[in-house]
Interface confidence: low
């Protein structure tokens, strides 16, 4: 039986410092119920970048209207990129619960930061 897929089509993205980075993520189903979250890094040290149900996240905007009930595009744009933003970003589907529990992760997108052009 085929499972929900989380598609992060870009293995890597390179952005100049000061610019915005777009990280793509789409899901293949609305099921199971629960939010999408973005993290930088993996494991216990990972950093929350965006949570569909929390906020605000001042530097993060969603590319699509994620409040639209049938939305399946959870791509994000991170503004004013700095070298500290470099790392691998994971789009992760959570199952709604008490608390929400991690259901499935995308494969990750590595963000590298180029020096700001002079």
């Amino acid at each position: 039986e085929e499972e929900l897929q989380i598609i992060q089509p870009d293995k890597s993205v390179s952005v100049a410092a000061g610019e915005s980075a777009i990280l793509h993520c789409t899901i293949t189903s609305l099921f199971p119920v629960g939010p999408i979250q973005w993290f930088r890094g993996a494991g216990p040290a990972r950093v929350l970048i965006y949570n569909q149900r929390q906020g605000p996240f001042p530097r993060v905007t969603t590319v699509s209207e994620t409040t639209k009930r049938e939305n399946m595009d959870f791509s994000i744009s991170i503004s004013n990129i700095t070298p500290a933003d470099a790392g691998t970003y994971y789009c992760i589907k959570f199952r709604k619960g008490s608390p929400d529990t991690e259901f499935k992760s995308g494969a990750g997108t590595e963000l590298s930061v180029r020096a700001k052009p002079s």
């Epitope: 039986e1 085929e2 499972e3 929900l4 897929q5 293949t28 189903s29 609305l30 099921f31 199971p32 119920v33 009930r69 049938e70 399946m72 199952r95 709604k96 619960g97 008490s98």
Partner: antibody, heavy 118, light 108 residues
Framework: DVQLVESGGGVVRPGESLRLSCAAS????????MSWVRQGPGEGLEWVAG????????WYADSVKGRFTISRDNSKNTLYLRLFSLRTEDTAIYYC???????????WGLGTLVTVSS | EIVLTQSPGTLSLSPGETATLSCRAS??????LAWYQQKPGQAPRLLIY???SRATGIPDRFSGSGSGTDFTLTISSLQSEDFAVYYC??????????FGGGTKVEIK
């Protein structure tokens, strides 16, 4: 107006097969996960199978797993359910139901009756 | 699989009275619960979703409450058209999506 019209029911013998169809109109079919829900004579409601809006992900109740196949053709706005190896306990009205964003059912068809009898 | 238990099985009331229907989940489903009404020979109709939100076109005499494992559907001032079978359904976990066994509201 949203309309769901099931067809394909009938009387079959145990072990035989059927294909049910559900013609959808009045909404953007490809924006919604869809399900089949059945109701045995004098019984309650039982969710049978569900399919993601693009058809890439399917889910089944344990009672029908391996015997029923749900599919959809978004170009025809039609949902299908193939019923194989039918048993007498599969006798029921089969309803096609549109899933809302949170996997409850906001619109239902009138149902099609499947009778499995020797 | 989450089991939903509805009580009572049958509720005998007169028009104008208030019906109180219960649905209990075997696990926490937060507010992910819907209520449906079904009349003989008809398909179910969505009444309440997210435990307490009325679906489009549903009269305000229907109200839902509860979260976690205990939920209530209240029908105030019963009308003749309200006598039917009512089902709860959880979508806080799954698949499978599960329904309660139903409560029949009949005329006393």
């Amino acid at each position: 107006d949203v309309q769901l019209v099931e067809s394909g029911g009938g009387v079959v013998r145990p072990g035989e097969s059927l294909r049910l169809s559900c013609a959808a109109s009045g909404f953007t079919f490809s924006d919604h996960d869809m399900s089949w829900v059945r109701q045995g004579p004098g019984e309650g409601l039982e969710w049978v199978a569900g399919i993601s809006l693009r058809g890439g992900v399917t889910w089944y109740a344990d009672s029908v797993k391996g015997r029923f196949t749900i599919s959809r053709d978004n170009s025809k706005n039609t949902l299908y359910l193939r019923l194989f190896s039918l048993r007498t306990e599969d006798t029921a009205i089969y309803y096609c139901a549109r899933e809302s964003w949170n996997t409850f059912f906001d619109y239902w068809g009138l149902g099609t009756l499947v009778t499995v009898s020797s | 699989e989450i089991v939903l238990t509805q009580s009572p099985g049958t509720l005998s009331l007169s028009p104008g009275e208030t019906a109180t229907l219960s649905c209990r989940a075997s696990q926490n489903v937060r507010s992910n619960l819907a209520w449906y009404q079904q009349k003989p020979g008809q398909a179910p109709r969505l009444l309440i979703y997210d435990a307490s939100s009325r679906a489009t076109g549903i009269p305000d005499r229907f109200s839902g409450s509860g979260s976690g494992t205990d939920f209530t559907l209240t029908i105030s001032s019963l009308q003749s058209e309200d006598f039917a079978v009512y089902y709860c359904q959880q979508y806080g976990n799954g698949p499978p999506l599960t329904f309660g066994g139903g409560t029949k509201v009949e005329i006393k």
